[in-house]
Every structure is written in structure tokens, then in C-alpha cells.
């Protein structure tokens, strides 16, 4: 039985050219996390954090994606095209797969505030 829940940074906004942290947290389960996948809105993989191998950033994103903090992901040099959904997929044993969603809005405005709140989707 899957007892865990994924908490995410929810809906966030950040300035064009700036950076943002995408964060998911799995709680309420003793399941072992074997791998975390980070996907973009078009379902292309940004990065994988395998418990044994460590981080792998996909080549197309190596210049703009940094691993961490923790199992999260930092997106840098944001462009308007980065606006959209991001998904974290936690592969666990024995529970199975948990999935969290974050929506990122990249704003042109120089006064855009970086808003982030933890929420359970």
C-alpha cells in the first residue's frame, strides 16, 4: 500500500534570467527511494538522481541545470520558454512510484517576486 505523500513547491514564479529551485519531498513512508527523475512539461528528462550512481544531468540541460539542493533541482538562466509544468518522479521500494507536479511561471518583469510555498498537490 502506498502511504506516502509528495510535497512540492507548488506554483512558483521567477524572473527571466534568474534561477529557481524545484523541490519535492516524499514523506509519510518508510519506502526506500531508489531513483528520482525530473521531467519538463514536454516530458523530456532534465535529470536523474540514482541512489547508487548519483546525479545525471541530460546533455541538453547541462549548462542550465544544477543538481540539488537535496533531491531538488536548480534551473538557471531562465527563459520564457521555461514556463510550464515540471514533474518529480520518486521510484521507491516497495511502494512503487510517486509523482509530484510544479508549475513554473517565468516573468519578464524585473519586479517579479520569487514565490514558493510547500503544498500537497
Amino acid at each position: 500500500m502506498m502511504t506516502g505523500t509528495i510535497e512540492t513547491t507548488g506554483n512558483i514564479s521567477a524572473k527571466k534570467g534568474g534561477s529557481v529551485i524545484l523541490q519535492c519531498h516524499l514523506s509519510s513512508t518508510m519506502a526506500q527511494v531508489t531513483q528520482v527523475n525530473w521531467e519538463q512539461h514536454d516530458h523530456s528528462l532534465l535529470a536523474i538522481r540514482n541512489a547508487e550512481l548519483g546525479w545525471h544531468i541530460y546533455p541538453a540541460f547541462k549548462d542550465r541545470v544544477a543538481p540539488g539542493p537535496g533531491l531538488g533541482l536548480t534551473l538557471q538562466s531562465l527563459t520564457m520558454n521555461d514556463t510550464g509544468e515540471y514533474f518529480c518522479t520518486y521510484h521507491t521500494y516497495p511502494d512503487g512510484t510517486y509523482r509530484g507536479r510544479i508549475f513554473l511561471e517565468v516573468l519578464e518583469s524585473s519586479v517579479a517576486e520569487h514565490s514558493a510555498r510547500f503544498q500537497i498537490p
Epitope: 531513483q35 540514482n50 550512481l53 521500494y93 516497495p94
Partner: antibody, heavy 124, light 108 residues
Framework: EVQLLESGGGLVQPGGSLRLSCAAS????????MSWVRQAPGKGLEWVSA????????WHADSVKGRFTISRDNSKNTLYLQMNSLRAEDTAVYYC?????????????????WGQGTLVTVSS | EIVMTQSPATLSVSPGERATLSCRAS??????LAWYQQKPGQAPRLLIY???TRATGIPARFSGSGSGTEFTLTISSLQSEDFAVYYC??????????FGGGTKVEIK
């Protein structure tokens, strides 16, 4: 700490059989893919067989297909390689190795953790 | 079966120098390539996977590059513990998963 300990190697005549075992500890054995890789004396590495975490899927190199069978007992945290119709060219150190992937993540077929190996000698 | 060819068979290098090892696949393996180090009497040690990603705990002096059919492992400044045999391995999604014949890095 991940540990893989092979046993069951030894001297066997051509046409004979051996069963290798690999006792795993230090990790949750069940979900992870496992493989056997061998190395003939003074030679390079050769992948032999692989098995999924559940044991439902197996893969074998053409050189051993129909002669070798990989299996696992997740309740005993043990991997096996049943070797039949052995030939001189099967003489090698046999390593068991852990895949970083699971049934859920998919398998990598690369290996960070290896056992120390067990020597199989096929000779009359 | 995809054939992996490593060159040179032996590389003589002085400590502190750079070592460049090559691996060629008989057909494209995309970035599905790993590098291992093996010392006498020991099991192989995974260094690099996905052609260029270092495995956890591997020193930064080891780096990998290439894609398709041509790959390189570079050791930027050889330490005494780096003298060993190095193998490349392809792991395209379907078996068999094949290794190169190895490159022995020895002290010059």
C-alpha cells in the same frame, strides 16, 4: 555496505555442471537487477547473464544460451548461475554484479558493485 | 553484436601526466557507454557512465567524452593508484552488453 559474495566455483570436467551462488547483503535485494560477468585468465570482461529484480525476465549471452540459467531467490538474497555442458572456453573468474536500476526505474546494465569473483576451471 | 575496440592496448605514462584512452563502437551506442578500472586480483570499478557522467565518489581527474561510435576517457594527472587496466562497455537497451579489450596504463 553492499557486499556480494560468490561461491560454487571449482574444477569440473568438460560436459559437466556447476551451480554458482552469490549471497547479497547491505542492500534491499528484491528490486534490483543482477548480472553475471566473467573474465578468462589474462583476458577481458564478458557479460554472461542478467535477471530482473522480480526474476521474471532473464537475458543470456549467445555464448552460453541454452547451457547457462540465471535465477534468484529474493527470500534468501541470493543470485544463482546454473552452468551445464561446460566447455574449456568457460574457464574464467565469474563475478556477480548489482545493477543500479530496478523493475520500476528500468535497468542500466552497468555495475558499480561487484563480488570478488569465483574461479571456474573446465579441464579434463 | 556490437564490437568495442580500445586503443592503444598499452599506454606508458609518467605520474602527473595526462592519459587519453580511446574506445570505438562498431555501430552507434548513443551515449550508452561506461568506463571501468581494474587492478590485478580485483573486481572492476565503475568510473564513468552515460559517456561523461562520473559515478559517485570518482575523482574529478577522470573525465569521459564522446557519443555515437567514438569515445574517450581522459585522466588529467595520473596518480600512482591510477595505473591499471581500463575497459569500456556499451549498454544499448538490448543485450548483449559488450566490453572493449582493455587498455593497460603502465608507468613510463
Amino acid at each position: 555496505e553492499v557486499q556480494l559474495l560468490e561461491s560454487g566455483g571449482g574444477l569440473v570436467q568438460p560436459g559437466g555442471s556447476l551451480r554458482l551462488s552469490c549471497a547479497a547483503s547491505g542492500f534491499t535485494f528484491g528490486p534490483y537487477g543482477m548480472s553475471w560477468v566473467r573474465q578468462a585468465p589474462g583476458k577481458g570482461l564478458e557479460w554472461v547473464s542478467a535477471i530482473s529484480g522480480s526474476g521474471a525476465s532473464t537475458w543470456h549471452a549467445d555464448s552460453v544460451k541454452g547451457r547457462f540459467t540465471i535465477s534468484r531467490d529474493n527470500s534468501k538474497n541470493t543470485l544463482y548461475l546454473q552452468m551445464n555442458s561446460l566447455r574449456a572456453e568457460d574457464t574464467a573468474v565469474y563475478y556477480c554484479a548489482k545493477d543500479p536500476g530496478t523493475d520500476s526505474t528500468g535497468y542500466y546494465y552497468i555495475w558499480r558493485y561487484w563480488g570478488q569473483g569465483t574461479l571456474v576451471t573446465v579441464s579434463s | 553484436e556490437i564490437v568495442m575496440t580500445q586503443s592503444p592496448a598499452t599506454l606508458s605514462v609518467s605520474p602527473g601526466e595526462r592519459a587519453t584512452l580511446s574506445c570505438r563502437a562498431s555501430q552507434s551506442v548513443s551515449s550508452n557507454l561506461a568506463w571501468y578500472q581494474q587492478k590485478p586480483g580485483q573486481a572492476p570499478r565503475l568510473l564513468i557512465y552515460s559517456a561523461s557522467t562520473r559515478a559517485t565518489g570518482i575523482p574529478a581527474r577522470f573525465s569521459g567524452s564522446g557519443s555515437g561510435t567514438e569515445f574517450t576517457l581522459t585522466i588529467s594527472s595520473l596518480q600512482s593508484e591510477d595505473f591499471a587496466v581500463y575497459y569500456c562497455q556499451q549498454y544499448v537497451p538490448h543485450p548483449p552488453f559488450t566490453f572493449g579489450g582493455g587498455t593497460k596504463v603502465e608507468i613510463k
